[in-house]
């Protein structure tokens, strides 16, 4: 058993049929010694008396808020949560496996630049009685500070018969050094509590590996005289690291109709303009990627050919 | 060329060669994203490699103030990786695929280090650690980790030379 926060404790249980469970001793936070009784949750049934209560925790019915009283007055609470371990593996029932970029990916994180700011998100089908707490650091043995905000519900989607909820959190490295080569990864830890179930999820990454620039901005077209060709120009996204002579992007420019199966024109460039062939009912799209490190491409920025 | 006396390197040549290094480092090990090497005890095997750190003057302001600190750090790293790629980690079993770009990568590391430090001038170089894995599978894993680390190193070096070519070239 360990303390998650004040008056909230996590009991780690090997979860299998007829498991013996864990013996837990609760102590009432009071100077009183006599006349103390214990109850669980809203029940008035007295579970025991005395300053300590010994219980055998085997299942969720044994978890909950234990309260010690004296003469009708509440002295203190202890909330017990369960953390299940099945076949040596901690349960992952609360969050959905996003399976990208690999199986058992529960947390996904992205950064728009090298400033040390990043966003992580996760998915669940649970809508109520759900809380998250996020901590992060650079490195684990001698951790350096990363400050995370509160996790918030950022999107709801319908997937078949189920509703899916997306939560996200923003974090910022306290002393980021955008130009340096990272040697220690960022660690992100998410505590998830659903009713009386506790789970924790972790992710470890370098900022360079989660970079995904915003799409290029201010796409403009200029038809070339006596030609089917069009000069398309754009700018670096505002959120990208500066100076651009140091933090350079490379671009992919594509002309395509509405269907992916349609024919296309495609060219890669390090410049902020390119010449392509525009077709009726097609769109010109541009996306960006770090020029020197193959992290994710941005989403496309598009303008119609007409 | 960046000689210890402090004259400027051939920024544009260094830029071209460092960009080539980036391309080669990724073609030598393109599937890095599919293998989470940090799960394999990453810190004790590759924390000996020289990293370009915050105080090394490789940021745009540091380069403007005095690029020599940064160039020396990059030179150390290039020599270090060049030795690693020539060591039995890469030459031993399992043999590299005949079309592996590691040979080109090795030559390009040497080429860039020579651009930075001509014959007869010597910056101090970092000792190469004795990473001699006994098992072929350990060697394979170590190769992946070294190439992964090299990708990050040459990315920073390429940014330095691109910025230098754009803003510090005479």
């Amino acid at each position: 058993i360990w303390e998650l926060k004040k008056d909230v404790y996590v009991v780690e249980l090997d979860w299998y049929p007829d498991a013996p469970g864990e013996m837990v001793v609760l102590t009432c936070d009071t100077p009183e010694e006599d006349g103390i009784t214990w109850t669980l949750d809203q029940s008035s049934e007295v579970l025991g008396s005395g300053k300590t209560l010994t219980i055998q925790v085997k299942e969720f019915g044994d978890a909950g808020q234990y309260t010690c009283h004296k003469g009708g007055e509440v002295l203190s609470h202890s909330l017990l949560l369960l953390h299940k371990k099945e076949d040596g593996i901690w349960s992952t029932d609360i969050l959905k496996d996003q399976k990208e970029p690999k199986n058992k990916t529960f947390l996904r994180c992205e950064a728009k630049n090298y400033s040390g700011r990043f966003t992580c998100w996760w998915l669940t089908t649970i809508s109520t009685d759900l809380t998250f707490s996020v901590k992060s650091s650079r490195g684990s043995s001698d951790p350096q500070g990363v400050t995370c905000g509160a996790a918030t519900l950022s999107a709801e989607r319908v997937r078949g018969d189920n509703k899916e909820y997306e939560y996200s959190v923003e974090c910022q490295e306290d002393s980021a050094c955008p130009a340096a080569e990272e040697s220690l990864p960022i660690e992100v830890m998410v505590d998830a509590v659903h009713k009386l179930k506790y789970e924790n999820y972790t992710s470890s990454f370098f900022i360079r590996d989660i970079i995904k620039p915003d799409p290029p901005k201010n796409l403009q077209l200029k038809p070339l005289k006596n030609s089917r060709q069009v000069e398309v120009s754009w700018e670096y996204p505002d959120t990208w690291s500066t100076p651009h002579s140091y933090f350079s992007l490379t671009f992919c420019v594509q002309v395509q109709g509405k269907s992916k199966r349609e024919k296309k024109d495609r060219v890669f460039t390090d410049k902020t303009s390119a010449t392509v062939i525009c077709r009726k009912n097609a769109s010109i799209s541009v996306r960006a990627q770090d020029r020197y490190y193959s992290s994710s491409w941005s989403e496309w920025a598009s303008v119609p050919c007409s | 060329r960046a000689v210890p006396g402090g004259s400027s390197p051939a920024w544009t040549q260094c830029q071209q060669l460092s960009q080539k290094l980036c391309t080669l480092a990724w073609s030598a090990h393109p599937l890095v994203g599919h293998m989470d090497l940090r799960e394999e005890g990453d810190e004790e095997t590759t924390n000996d490699v020289p990293h370009i750190q915050c105080g090394d003057g490789c940021d745009p302001q540091g380069l403007r103030d005095n690029s020599q600190f940064c160039l020396q750090r990059i030179h150390q790293g290039l020599i270090f990786y060049e030795k690693l790629l020539g060591s039995d980690i890469f030459t031993g079993e399992p043999s590299l695929l005949p079309d592996s770009p590691v040979g080109q990568l090795h030559a390009s590391l040497l080429g860039l280090s020579q651009l930075l430090q001509p014959e007869g001038h010597h910056w101090e170089t970092q000792q190469i650690p004795s990473l001699s894995p006994s098992q072929p599978w350990q060697r394979l894993l170590l190769r992946f980790k070294i190439l992964r680390s090299l990708q990050a190193f040459v990315a920073v070096a390429a940014r330095v030379f691109a910025h230098g070519a754009a803003t510090l070239s005479p």
Epitope: R228, K263, V267, D270, T275 | -
Partner: antibody
């Protein structure tokens, strides 16, 4: 499968014109760009231009501007390349080539030998 | 127009050996570079597109690398059917242009 079949060899006199055909099969004709590339005997490849069979748009290499016309007939899935004012150095194998991507060539015809000789 | 230069013009290699073919552009073309193989009396065949992307059906012994102005086609272990002429082609800008070709012949 995607296939391009070209017309047979031609022998022309200097100053004449030649029209080479290229019949496409195995795909929807308007779904691919069509290019013409030529190769003089013992020489390398030279791009001449492209046509979009969907709308007839064309782009010619500057060298061939004014001397070449590329057309298509969607009813027969056939592309044509006409070269006018032939000279002896137009003697070459002329290839049609197609792709869904505009700037490189995925599928090639077998080539048509055009000999310009007096 | 962009001039593409291939070297060497002829490469003599023994079967089973590795062949490295070079292609240089007269200006930076990012990764807009494609490789073709042509055997005598036949049309060219696309091997690699956008510098390093492999084509299904093309043996894995063919690989491409490079960006900017310098590109390489590597044939890791030459088979008898690989003796041919190889062309690079840039697609950075029109007119599309080819290199002069490298003939890979039996040593």
């Amino acid at each position: 499968q995607v296939q391009l079949v070209q017309s047979g060899a031609e022998v022309e006199k200097p100053g004449a014109s030649v029209k080479v055909s290229c019949k496409a099969s195995g795909y929807t004709f308007t779904d691919y760009y069509l290019h013409w590339v030529r190769q003089a005997p013992g020489q390398g490849l030279e791009w001449m231009g492209w046509i979009d069979p969907e709308n007839g748009d064309t782009e010619y290499a500057p060298k061939f501007q004014g001397g070449v016309t590329m057309t298509t007939d969607t009813s027969t899935s056939t592309a044509y390349m006409e070269l006018r004012s032939l000279r002896s150095d137009d003697t070459a194998v002329y290839y049609c080539a197609a792709n869904k991507e505009l700037r490189y060539f995925d599928v090639w015809g077998q080539g048509t030998m055009v000999t310009v000789s007096s | 127009e962009i001039v593409m230069t291939q070297s060497p013009a002829t490469l003599s290699v023994s079967p089973g050996e590795r062949a490295t073919l070079s292609c240089r552009a007269s200006q930076s073309i990012s990764i807009n570079l494609h490789w073709y193989q042509q055997k005598p009396g036949q049309a060219p065949r696309l091997l690699i597109y956008f510098a390093s992307q492999s084509i299904s059906g093309i043996p894995a012994r063919f690989s491409g690398s490079g960006s900017g102005t310098e590109f390489t086609l590597t044939i890791s272990s030459l088979q008898s059917e690989d003796f041919a002429v190889y062309y690079c082609q840039q697609s950075n800008s029109f007119p599309l242009t080819f290199g002069g070709g490298t003939k890979v012949e039996i040593k």
